[in-house]
Interface confidence: low
């Protein structure tokens, strides 16, 4: 339904508080280097303008699109060219090209300082002194570091962030109350950002059809009692929401997400029996809860899939009549019967089914040709099952840190050209699959593990896309969204790689390592491990283990020494020499 003023429409729908928060997120996700104060100023100007349009929708400029209004506002930033370089050229373009240009300049790895957490008392004072500014700063800092963060969900995180400070700044032991909550928000936030990044990559790199297929599979697993038409409706609406958010249309996205939550709750009887609790919550919590809701129970006595999709004489007729709908029905029927499969596996099966029909429906005897199509699924199902079994056994044997190290070595040998920080970050995250998924029973392991790995490998893909260095990574990332993980799994040691020159500086450590947290110390050691493999790609597991054990002992010894710095200097030289000898460098 058309509105005279889009900005007035969204302001009224969302309310002033959410409107301002979403505009701040949008601006921070576009101009990631701008100071907080500049963004606040821009947001206030837009908000004042929106209020004039609410008062009179016919007022000057109120009929302009949100992209035009926001783009015009961003292009008033004085230091655009100095700060962003060629991004300033976007401002010479007209909509919609200008917005597309801004989107292309979003940076997944912006050169921003690490967020350092101040002392609890300092944070509580800042919270009490100016709660509004404190919370805006949170939105700003997260949005600029995560330019694809799902904006309506970030509002939910901000609400929890505020609740944590409200409760804990009054507690007897503020730190004991607050720090675990902030840690949880940080970890959940990183996971949420990465999951949304995959959705946006799916839409932007592989198109709406790919996203819709993913959504059909996931929603059919989650809502197996819902009819196909109902799932189709939800998929269409969900696709619109994510297309908007990934496209920077955050006001429309938040508004449509609220409408979708309302629709789901009004129709929960025909969607899922698990929605009752979610639907009793306030809006932000409700939407989050629905997105995370557990799978409903499968309907009893579902008939065999073979009848409609293999045995029926009408398979090719139905396929020809409406290919995507027929494949959608296949995916729906298969997914609702298999909550134990990963979404990407279900999509591989659907792709195999589609390829078979394409071939067989043109054959002399179609039925004879596609009669055994379900037999082709067996190896596709067994491959991730076996991989997860092996890796969970390895995880249980090694524990998380050493499991991460095994993956670091494995992936560095596969793609040694990738930067060390990226290899460390991605391998550490890949390694977390163990503690996240291996504890689950068999029926839940594959959806947990393989769909999580898809999210992590997408991080590798988006980071690599910014500065491509490996044809193998580019190939695995771009050829097929659902086959990324099998593609990376299948990579062997890169025999074409020329080992890196040995640089003693890379392996020189100082006393500051002793004051680092356990996590940061691990990262230092894992960085050294990656560099070792880059110097000596043919090193055996045993050789690398010996060097890493020596390294751990060296750090422990020097951190206990009276003169730590001297110890690191002298013992470090010995360690480097011993390592070179052990690895034959």
């Amino acid at each position: 339904d058309a509105h005279k003023s889009e900005v007035a429409h969204r302001f009224k729908d969302l309310g002033e508080e959410n409107f301002k928060a979403l505009v701040l997120i949008a601006f921070a996700q576009y101009l990631q280097q701008c100071p907080f104060e500049d963004h606040v100023k821009l947001v206030n100007e837009v908000t004042e303008f929106a209020k004039t349009c609410v008062a009179d929708e016919s007022a000057e400029n109120c009929d302009k699109s949100l992209h035009t209004l926001f783009g015009d506002k961003l292009c008033t930033v004085a230091t655009l060219r100095e700060t962003y370089g060629e991004m300033a050229d976007c401002c010479a373009k007209q909509e919609p090209e200008r917005n597309e240009c801004f989107l292309q300049h979003k940076d997944d790895n912006p050169n921003l300082p690490r967020l350092v957490r101040p002392e609890v008392d300092v944070m509580c004072t800042a919270f009490h002194d100016n709660e509004e500014t404190f919370l805006k700063k949170y939105l700003y800092e997260i949005a600029r570091r995560h330019p694809y963060f799902y904006a309506p969900e970030l509002l939910f995180f901000a609400k929890r962030y505020k609740a944590a400070f409200t409760e804990c700044c009054q507690a007897a032991d503020k730190a004991a109350c607050l720090l675990p909550k902030l840690d949880e928000l940080r970890d959940e936030g990183k996971a949420s950002s990465a999951k949304q990044r995959l959705k946006c990559a799916s839409l932007q790199k592989f198109g709406e059809r790919a996203f819709k297929a993913w959504a059909v599979a996931r929603l059919s697993q989650r809502f197996p009692k819902a009819e196909f038409a109902e799932v189709s409706k939800l998929v269409t609406d969900l696709t619109k929401v994510h297309t908007e958010c990934c496209h920077g249309d955050l006001l429309e996205c938040a508004d449509d997400r609220a409408d979708l939550a309302k629709y789901i709750c009004e129709n929960q009887d025909s969607i899922s029996s698990k929605l009752k609790e979610c639907c009793e919550k306030p809006l932000l919590e409700k939407s989050h809860c629905i997105a995370e809701v557990e799978n409903d129970e499968m309907p009893a006595d579902l008939p065999s899939l073979a009848a409609d999709f293999v045995e029926s004489k009408d398979v090719c007729k139905n396929y020809a009549e409406a290919k995507d709908v027929f494949l959608g029905m296949f995916l729906y029927e298969y997914a609702r019967r298999h909550p134990d499969y990963s979404v990407v596996l279900l999509l591989r099966l659907a792709k195999t089914y589609e390829t078979t029909l394409e071939k067989c429906c043109a054959a002399a005897d179609p039925h004879e040709c596609y009669a055994k199509v379900f037999d082709e699924f067996k190896p596709l199902v067994e491959e991730p099952q076996n991989l997860i079994k092996q890796n969970c056994e390895l995880f249980e044997q090694l524990g998380e840190y050493k499991f991460q190290n095994a993956l670091l070595v494995r992936y560095t040998k596969k793609v040694p050209q990738v930067s060390t920080p990226t290899l460390v970050e991605v391998s550490r995250n890949l390694g977390k699959v163990g503690s996240k998924c291996c504890k689950h029973p068999e029926a839940k392991r594959m959806p947990c593990a393989e769909d999580y790995l898809s999210v992590v490998l997408n991080q590798l893909c988006v980071l690599h896309e910014k500065t491509p260095v490996s044809d193998r990574v580019t190939k695995c990332c771009t050829e097929s969204l659902v086959n990324r993980r099998p593609c990376f799994s299948a990579l062997e040691v890169d025999e074409t790689y020329v080992p890196k020159e040995f640089n003693a500086e890379t392996f020189t450590f100082h006393a500051d390592i002793c004051t680092l947290s356990e996590k940061e110390r691990q990262i230092k050691k894992q960085t050294a491990l990656v560099e070792l493999v880059k110097h000596k790609p043919k090193a055996t597991k045993e050789q690398l283990k010996a060097v890493m054990d020596d390294f751990a002992a060296f750090v422990e010894k020097c951190c206990k020494a009276d003169d730590k710095e001297t110890c690191f200097a002298e013992e470090g030289k010995k360690l480097v020499a011993a390592s070179q000898a052990a690895l034959g460098l």
Partner: nanobody
């Protein structure tokens, strides 16, 4: 839920024509297979015609082939049944039905949603 409302029934002489309409409202979203069924007094409900969601696939009962035409306008959420060369044995209550899916459904159990029906009477 999906509501279906039929209209266009009435009294017509043998050899005459009628056009039935069925409007879907509520949660109407493609893909839906739409069907027409009829029930004469004292008889079972029987299949008349069905149309796939895109309108590309049609199917008719042998008794109405060549006389009845089913069509749909998805923009208006409406399905039509054009009935020509009507015979007294076409007298019945005509029901519109909807089912999510692809292909042609000829059995009542395949349909999830039903209208209240519209009376068609064909006199000699």
């Amino acid at each position: 839920q999906v509501q279906l409302v039929e209209s266009g029934g009435g009294l017509v002489q043998a050899g005459g024509s009628l056009r039935l309409s069925c409007v879907a409202s509520g949660r109407t979203f493609e893909p839906f297979v739409m069907g027409w069924f009829r029930q004469a007094p004292g008889k079972e409900r029987e299949f008349v015609a069905t149309i796939s969601w895109s309108g590309g696939s049609l199917s008719y009962a042998d008794s109405v082939k060549g006389r009845f035409t089913v069509s749909r306008d998805n923009a208006k959420n409406t399905v039509y049944l054009q009935m020509n060369s009507l015979k007294p044995e076409d007298t019945a209550v005509y029901y519109c039905a909807a089912a999510p899916g692809v292909g042609n459904y000829r059995y009542t159990f395949q349909y999830d949603y039903w209208g209240q029906g519209t009376q068609v009477t064909v006199s000699e």
